[in-house]
């Protein structure tokens, strides 16, 4: 058993049929010694008396809020949550496996630049009685500070018969050094509580691996005289790290016809312009990627050929 926060405790249980469970001793937080009784949740049934209560925790029916009283007055509470371990593996019932970039990906994180600011998000099908708490650090043995805000519900998605809830959190490394080579990864830890079930999820990454630039801005077309060609130009996104001579991007320019089946023409360039053939009813799209490290491409910026 360990303390998650004040008066909230997590009991770790091996979860299999007829498992013996864990013996837990609860102590009433009071100087009183006599006349103390214990109840669970809203029940008035007295479970025991005395300053301590010993219980065998085997299932969710044994978890909940234990309260010690004296003469009708509440003295203290202890909330017991369960953390299930099945076949040696901690349960992951609360969050949905996003399966990208690989199986068992519960947390996904992205950074728009090297400032040390990043966003993580996760999915669940659970709509009520759900709380999240997020902590982060750089490194784990001698951790350096990363400050995370509160996790908030950011979107709801209906996919077929399923409803998914997307939560996100923003974090900022306290003393980020954008140009420094990272040697220790960022660690993100999410505590999830659904009713009386506790689970924890972790992700470990270098900022360089989660970089996803914003799309290029000011995408413009300039027709070239007596030609079907156009000059496409764009600029670095405002959110990208500076100076751009050091934090450089590379770009992919794509000409896409109206039909998805039409062949796509693609050009790769380090410049902020390119010359392409603009077909009727086609659109031109440009996306960006860190020039020196193959992290994610940005979303596409697009403009119609017409």
């Amino acid at each position: 058993i360990w303390e998650l926060k004040k008066d909230v405790y997590v009991v770790e249980l091996d979860w299999y049929p007829d498992a013996p469970g864990e013996m837990v001793v609860l102590t009433c937080d009071t100087p009183e010694e006599d006349g103390i009784t214990w109840t669970l949740d809203q029940s008035s049934e007295v479970l025991g008396s005395g300053k301590t209560l010993t219980i065998q925790v085997k299932e969710f029916g044994d978890a909940g809020q234990y309260t010690c009283h004296k003469g009708g007055e509440v003295l203290s509470h202890s909330l017991l949550l369960l953390h299930k371990k099945e076949d040696g593996i901690w349960s992951t019932d609360i969050l949905k496996d996003q399966k990208e970039p690989k199986n068992k990906t519960f947390l996904r994180c992205e950074a728009k630049n090297y400032s040390g600011r990043f966003t993580c998000w996760w999915l669940t099908t659970i709509s009520t009685d759900l709380t999240f708490s997020v902590k982060s650090s750089r490194g784990s043995s001698d951790p350096q500070g990363v400050t995370c805000g509160a996790a908030t519900l950011s979107a709801e998605r209906v996919r077929g018969d399923n409803k998914e809830y997307e939560y996100s959190v923003e974090c900022q490394e306290d003393s980020a050094c954008p140009a420094a080579e990272e040697s220790l990864p960022i660690e993100v830890m999410v505590d999830a509580v659904h009713k009386l079930k506790y689970e924890n999820y972790t992700s470990s990454f270098f900022i360089r691996d989660i970089i996803k630039p914003d799309p290029p801005k000011n995408l413009q077309l300039k027709p070239l005289k007596n030609s079907r060609q156009v000059e496409v130009s764009w600029e670095y996104p405002d959110t990208w790290s500076t100076p751009h001579s050091y934090f450089s991007l590379t770009f992919c320019v794509q000409v896409q016809g109206k039909s998805k089946r039409e062949k796509k023409d693609r050009v790769f360039t380090d410049k902020t312009s390119a010359t392409v053939i603009c077909r009727k009813n086609a659109s031109i799209s440009v996306r960006a990627q860190d020039r020196y490290y193959s992290s994610s491409w940005s979303e596409w910026a697009s403009v119609p050929c017409s």
């Epitope: 996003q98 996904r108 992205e110 966003t119 998000w121 999915l123 950011s154 979107a155 998605r157 997307e166 996100s168 914003d214 799309p215 290029p216 801005k217 000011n218 995408l219 764009w234 996104p237 405002d238 959110t239 998805k260 440009v286 979303e299 910026a301 697009s302 403009v303 119609p304």
Partner: nanobody, 123 residues
Framework: EVQLVESGGGLVQAGGSLRLSCEAS????????MGWFRQSPGREREFVTS????????YYADSVKGRFIIATDDAKNTVYLRMNSLKPEDTAVYYC????????????????WGQGTQVTVSS
């Protein structure tokens, strides 16, 4: 050309809720980023929220964070803006828009716009 059609606006008392809908005419549109903006008389069009249909990277204006929430329905090719704890200052015409290029927060970055739906919050 993709068309966006908003609905669901109306008159509501402060503290109340509304759900705006935006239906996209083309199925392929659900692969894109979209946004909601609002405009009240004599003011510039203001960013409300921006999101990607495929997930992640959802952004909200500070003034609506925690009160407004994006919801999407793939089968109906529709995006919803659920507005809770409405305030008189939320009164505006609300537009849904399809992203084109540039900053997610700028109206200039969106190339396809709906006709707008009026939301009035009375005190």
């Amino acid at each position: 050309e993709v068309q966006l059609v908003e609905s669901g606006g109306g008159l509501v008392q402060a503290g109340g809720s509304l759900r705006l809908s935006c239906e996209a005419s083309e199925r392929t549109f659900s692969t894109y980023r979209m946004g909601w903006f609002r405009q009240s008389p004599g003011r510039e069009r203001e960013f409300v929220t921006s999101f990607n249909w495929s997930g992640g990277s959802t952004y909200y204006a500070d003034s609506v964070k925690g009160r407004f929430i994006i919801a999407t329905d793939d089968a109906k090719n529709t995006v919803y803006l659920r507005m809770n704890s409405l305030k008189p200052e939320d009164t505006a015409v609300y537009y849904c828009a399809g992203y084109s290029s540039g900053s997610y927060y700028s109206p200039r970055s969106y190339g396809v716009w709906g006709q707008g739906t009026q939301v009035t919050v009375s005190s």
